[in-house]
Structure formats: structure tokens, C-alpha cells
């Protein structure tokens, strides 16, 4: 095999046998029973145990539930391609009893000129080509079919769309004599939707377009277009919604300005400005109309595009997102943090919080991290005592109960969850930080000291003594 390696870290079991079950007749009520959490507010653990027990007892009745894997389908329309001209595709795990469809857009930065696309092709080829994709993928986090890992939508039809267009899911240009690479991210989404209509999506009640990182930005750029596409194809009853994870970036001033040389040091505005031209990028029509020609790059930034969107979108964003810090040239390596940098980081959290002020459905923990929804432990983080799956459930209910336009939250079911504490990991449910050298878990106080945050400085604005603050943090309060 010429010494070629495939991405072995992904499970590569052989694909499951082809399915032969008959599809449900059109119009047949096939939605699984809705879960109403109101009666179990105080006893979620017991409720989840019952759900798990019920699910497991039903497993034998449902052959496709036995296999956790999503299976690869390369697009039949082979003119819709990855960067290198190989066909794009998607991984699918059907759930015949459900009319919910989750389409997940993978992330993985981007490239914006010939040079950095060439080097990306030589080092991260699976993000530019389908040639070595494994035949199956395991669904994790929100893509898991296990109710304990995915209490939100475990029974949905799961679709994972690999990112192989390097264009933040915005491109609409094919490979040609002139173009060494194709950039067809926006077209890939459209074609996947078209193909899925023939695989059961036509009977869907809800299509949730989700994504992480560049995929999260891809959600903001494409959700209205998907809704429009389905309307035009004669499926106006399918409710299209968006879930954008770690794709809500700020076009803020970098901590240290650097020239636009490579993907991760180039200021995001400049990278996108260059990228849009290189990719022939498309942005949502209503947003495009708000900016002059040549200024379409603005629509890649959540707080600018969001107000123009028609579809409901739930925004998930760490207040101290690692990708945001990277493009801002903030690199935390365990060395003490100087005051200027500490203030910069705290201000970033403040700015991000401000941009989410008018986003009714949002979940923004004060953590230093990146991406969450396809992590296995995505259920662990809480904001104001509410987990993300729970917030998403509340969002579903608010939309179901026609609260879309209302800012009044359902009683005991919040959807606007933004941390207000002002420094990284001040939320004790943040993902665990480990000292990379010792492997030891660090509590919040240790982490802050490790980062060089002076406890006196952190405690003062809270009106606390350092010892009181340390006690609170150590106790996880």
C-alpha cells in the first residue's frame, strides 16, 4: 500500500450489511414519542435510568440500533467535490422511527491561498480529499444513539458531513485548468440535502443543521439556504434550525498583530477577506445586502450575520475559545500571564458575552476550550445549573410552543445561558484541565495560578479576599 497511512484514530470497522427494511409509507406517523421533562425536573438521574432501560429493552426490536456506526455514502453527483476533485460525501445512521434529522458539519480551519492550501493538502489530506476516508464513523456526543451520551436527540437520524472543502462551508467554485482546487462547501451541503431527501429526509419534521468550529460558522452561513432549498423543492413543512458550536468568532483586534502568512496567525478578517475571493464564497443573501460589494467577509462573523437569519439558531460558544485566542495570537503555554494579556483575555470574554446579549438561545460557559457538541462528555458542562442537552430540549419546547419570537423563557426551562463570571474556568463545571507534564487534574484555583492569574487581582473585583475566593473555587462553587 505504498506506506500510506489512513486516519487510524477513527474506528474503521467494516460497514454494516445493507439494510432491506421497507421505508415507512409517506405521511405515516413515525415520530418517536416526545419526551416531556417537566414532570422529572428534580429527578433527572432516575428519569434517565428509566429511558436507558426502556431503550435497551427496545434494542432487540430495532436492528439498526445495534450498530453505533454511521456509514459512508459518497455523493452520487460526483461533480460536487472535495478540494482535490474526489467526490464529497456524508456518513449516515438512519433511525426509522424518527422524523428528526441531525446534519453535522465538521470543522477544521481553512486555507485561503495556493501556498497554504498546498501544504494543507500535504499534511491534512483528509480535510481536502475523500480518497482515504474510513467506511464508517462512530457517532459521539450529539451524534450518539445512546440515550445516556445523548439525552437530547439520541433517536434522531444522524448525518456527519466531513469537511473537505477548506472554505468554511462557503465555497461555490469547481476545480478547473485555472483553479488547482475546488471549493464547494456550500454546494456540498445542498447536494447532501438533495440526496437525503431520497433516503427519508422528505418525511422529516425537523432538520437540525449543526456544526463545530468552521462547521459552526458553516451553520450560520448555510442554515437559511437549506430552508430555502427545501421550500423550493416542495418541503415547506420541514422545520430547519441551526446549532452553531464554537463558530461564533469576533473580528476583534489581535493581542499582537502579525502579518497574514499562514492560517493560524492571519487575522480572521484578513484571512476571510482573502478566502472569500479564492473560494468564490457565498454568504446569506439577507446579510450580503447589508454590506457593500467586497465586504461580504463581515457575514462570517456570528454577531453580524445572526440578526439577518430567518431560521432559529442556537449558539454554543466558550467565552474563552481556543481558536479565537489562537487567531488573536494569544498562546497560553503555562508561563505566567502578564497583566496586559490577562486584561485582554478577560475583555475577550466580556466582548463575547456582549455579542450574545440579544441571542435568545445561547449557551456560553466561561471556559477555555474549543468545540463541545460531539464530545462524549458534552453533557457535563452547566451554565447556571443547566446542561447543554437540557438547554437544547428547552429550546425545542420553546419553538414547539410557538415561543420563537418571544424572549420570555419557559418557566424552569432556560435557553439563554451565558456565564457572567469574568475569567477562564471560573465555572467549576468547565472541562477538566490537566497539567500536561504531570497528567494531574487541576482545580480552578490551580489552573488560574498555573496561568499566572494573581489571586489578589482576580478576587478584588468580586469583593473577596484571595483566601475566600480560593475556598470557593476549591469547593467548586
Amino acid at each position: 500500500s505504498e506506506g500510506r497511512k489512513t486516519w487510524r484514530r477513527r474506528g474503521q470497522q467494516p460497514p454494516p450489511p445493507p439494510r432491506t427494511e421497507a421505508a415507512p409509507a409517506a405521511g405515516q406517523p413515525v415520530e418517536s414519542f416526545p419526551l416531556d421533562f417537566t414532570a422529572v425536573e428534580g429527578n433527572m438521574d432516575s428519569f434517565m435510568a428509566q429511558v436507558k432501560s426502556l431503550a435497551q429493552s427496545l434494542y432487540p426490536c430495532s436492528a439498526q440500533q445495534l450498530n453505533e456506526d454511521l456509514r459512508l455514502h459518497l455523493l452520487l453527483n460526483t461533480s460536487v467535490t472535495c478540494n482535490d476533485g474526489s467526490p464529497a460525501g456524508y456518513y449516515l445512521k438512519e433511525s426509522r422511527g424518527s422524523r428528526r434529522w441531525l446534519l453535522f458539519l465538521e470543522g477544521g480551519w481553512y486555507c485561503f491561498n495556493r501556498e497554504n492550501c498546498d501544504s494543507r493538502y500535504d499534511t491534512m489530506r483528509r480535510l481536502m480529499s475523500s480518497r482515504d476516508w474510513p467506511r464508517t464513523r462512530t457517532g459521539t456526543g450529539i451524534l450518539s444513539s445512546q440515550p445516556e451520551e445523548n439525552p437530547y436527540w439520541w433517536n434522531a437520524n444522524m448525518v456527519f458531513i466531513p469537511y473537505c472543502s477548506s472554505d468554511v462551508w462557503s465555497g461555490a467554485s469547481s476545480k478547473s485548468e485555472k483553479n488547482e482546487y475546488a471549493f464547494m462547501g456550500a454546494l456540498i451541503i445542498q447536494e447532501v440535502v438533495r440526496e437525503l431527501l431520497g433516503r427519508g429526509l422528505s418525511g422529516a419534521k425537523v432538520l437540525l443543521l449543526a456544526g463545530s468550529s468552521a462547521g459552526g460558522t458553516g451553520v450560520l452561513l448555510n442554515v437559511d439556504r437549506v430552508a430555502e432549498q427545501l421550500e423550493k423543492l416542495g418541503y415547506p413543512a420541514i422545520q430547519v434550525r441551526g446549532l452553531a458550536d464554537s463558530g461564533w468568532f469576533l473580528d476583534n483586534k489581535q493581542y499582537r498583530h502579525t502579518d497574514c502568512v499562514d492560517t493560524i496567525t492571519c487575522a480572521p478578517t484578513e484571512a476571510i477577506r482573502r478566502g472569500i475571493r479564492y473560494w468564490n464564497g457565498v454568504v446569506p443573501e439577507r446579510c450580503r445586502r447589508q454590506f457593500q460589494e467586497g465586504e461580504e467577509w463581515n457575514c462570517f462573523f456570528g454577531y453580524k450575520v445572526y440578526p439577518t437569519l430567518r431560521c432559529p439558531v442556537f449558539v454554543v460558544q466558550w467565552l474563552f475559545d481556543e481558536a479565537q485566542l489562537t487567531v488573536d495570537n494569544v498562546h497560553l503555554t503555562g508561563q505566567p500571564v502578564q497583566e496586559g494579556l490577562r486584561l485582554y483575555i478577560q475583555n475577550l470574554g466580556r466582548e463575547l458575552r456582549h455579542t450574545l446579549k440579544d441571542v435568545p438561545a445561547s449557551f456560553a460557559p466561561a471556559c477555555l476550550s474549543h468545540e463541545i457538541i460531539i464530545r462524549s462528555h458534552w453533557t457535563d458542562v452547566q451554565v447556571k445549573g443547566t446542561s447543554l442537552p437540557r438547554a437544547l430540549h428547552c429550546w425545542d419546547r420553546s419553538l414547539h410552543d410557538s415561543h420563537k419570537a418571544s424572549k420570555t423563557p419557559l418557566k424552569g426551562c432556560p435557553v439563554h445561558l451565558v456565564d457572567s463570571c469574568p475569567w477562564p474556568h471560573c465555572n467549576p463545571s468547565c472541562p477538566t484541565v490537566r497539567d500536561q507534564f504531570t497528567g494531574q487534574e487541576m482545580n480552578v484555583a490551580q489552573f488560574l495560578m498555573h496561568m499566572g492569574f494573581d489571586m489578589q487581582t482576580v478576587a478584588q473585583p468580586q469583593g473577596l479576599e484571595p483566601s475566600e475566593l480560593l475556598g470557593m473555587l476549591s469547593n467548586g462553587s
Epitope: R4, D118, T123, M124, S213, I264
Partner: antibody, heavy 119, light 111 residues
């Protein structure tokens, strides 16, 4: 099996030139980015230069920029490094290495060729 | 450029004992679920040999006493039970962006 063989090293005076070659076999050469890496006597590894799989993009370490030129001939399965204006600090063993495209790690190295710059 | 710093510069460990080498990047070398950090072993008079790629994946043919861990900026190479043939210089290397860079190397000896 996968093999890389460097040649062209030797003794040269400061200011002189040399051209190193790397012959590849056992794999589809045009599929892989290729690199030159050097190691001064008793010192660590230093990345020198990269040529993309198609040969359309090249990169250099600052220490050799403007003096060294990397090129490749995919039809001949060969990688080259033209070294001009050589300095004493360019004295090293020069390795060509293949970068795996699922991560950019060097999964195959040549045995190296020695370049000595001395008057 | 991303600067890679290894520690310690040299290390002496008894046969059968655990050896740990650290590598720190000046900025994150992780993206999209992968960490673009790799480890090589070099013995005198030989070219380097790949041990671990993408932070934790063992190259085929490499004994499983070698393991790698870490993400973001901090990474570790561990040899669980040192053997005589493990005496060598070990290098970390990142391929997150060009220019690629190496750590300065860690010389591992037997105590």
C-alpha cells in the same frame, strides 16, 4: 519497499555551490510533500525546505532563504536542493524525508549525504 | 514560527524504569481533534526513526513500551520500561504549519 537515497554531498569552499539529489522509489512520489532536513555535527535536527506534492509551492527556513532552491521532477521520482553561497554553518548531514499526508510527520528518511563547507 | 522546547536536555534512567520526555510548543499545534506533534528516535550514525505520530499513535513496528500523550501546547513521550536499545536522542517535531520545527533533542542514557 519505500526508499530514499541522497547524493551530491561533498567538500566545498565558502561561497561555493552544490546540488543535492534524492531518488525515491517504492511509492507514488507525486502523492507526497517532500522535505530537506539537516543536522550539523553534534547538533539537533533543523528543517530546511519543503516542496509540495505537485511542486507548485515551496517553503524555506529563514537561514537558507535566498540561497537554497528546492525543486522536484515527479516524472523522475526525484527531489533536488540547489545550494548557493554556501557558508561554514551550512556544514551538516542533509536528509531528504517524505511527509505523510495524514499528519505531515516524516515517515521515511534517507540515509543522508554530508556537506562540508570549509576553506 | 512555532518554537518547540524539550525537557530535559538529557536523562539517565535505570533499565526497566520509566522514562519521560516533555515537549512544549510556543503555541497550540492541535486542531480538529488532532495534535500535529510527532516523536523520533535517532541513534548515532543513523537517520531519525518515527516512533509516535499525531501525539499518541504508535508507528507500526515500534514496541508498545513507547507511548505519547498531550494536546494543545504540552506533550509527553513515555517509555514505560527502559531497554538497553532505547539509548538514543529523541526529538519532537510539529507539522501544524510551515515552517516545521523540531525540539532541540533529549539524550537518553542508562543510569
Amino acid at each position: 519497499q519505500v526508499q530514499l537515497v541522497e547524493s551530491g554531498g561533498g567538500l566545498v569552499k565558502p561561497g561555493g555551490s552544490l546540488r543535492l539529489s534524492c531518488a525515491a522509489s517504492g511509492f507514488t512520489f507525486s502523492d507526497f510533500g517532500m522535505h530537506w532536513i539537516r543536522q550539523a555535527p553534534g547538533k539537533g535536527l533543523e528543517w530546511v525546505s519543503y516542496s509540495s506534492s505537485g511542486g507548485t509551492t515551496v517553503y524555506y527556513a529563514d537561514s537558507v532563504k535566498g540561497r537554497f532552491t528546492i525543486s522536484r521532477d515527479n516524472a523522475k521520482n526525484s527531489l533536488y536542493l540547489q545550494m548557493n553561497s554556501l557558508r561554514a554553518e551550512d556544514t551538516a548531514v542533509y536528509y531528504c524525508a517524505r511527509a505523510s499526508y495524514d499528519g505531515g510527520y516524516f515517515d521515511c528518511w534517507g540515509q543522508g549525504t554530508t556537506v562540508t563547507v570549509s576553506s | 514560527d512555532i518554537v518547540m522546547t524539550q525537557s530535559p536536555d538529557s536523562l539517565a534512567v535505570s533499565l526497566g524504569e520509566r522514562a519521560t520526555i516533555n515537549c512544549r510548543a510556543s503555541k497550540s499545534v492541535s486542531t480538529s481533534g488532532y495534535s500535529y506533534i510527532h516523536w523520533y528516535q535517532q541513534k548515532p550514525g543513523q537517520p531519525p526513526k518515527l516512533l509516535i505520530y499525531l501525539a499518541s499513535d504508535l508507528e507500526s513496528g515500534v514496541p508498545d513500551r513507547f507511548s505519547g500523550s498531550g494536546s494543545g501546547t504540552d506533550f509527553t513521550l513515555t517509555i514505560s520500561s527502559l531497554q538497553a536499545e532505547d539509548v538514543a536522542v529523541y526529538y519532537c517535531h510539529h507539522s501544524r504549519e510551515l515552517p516545521f520545527t523540531f525540539g532541540q533533542g533529549t539524550k537518553l542514557e542508562i543510569k
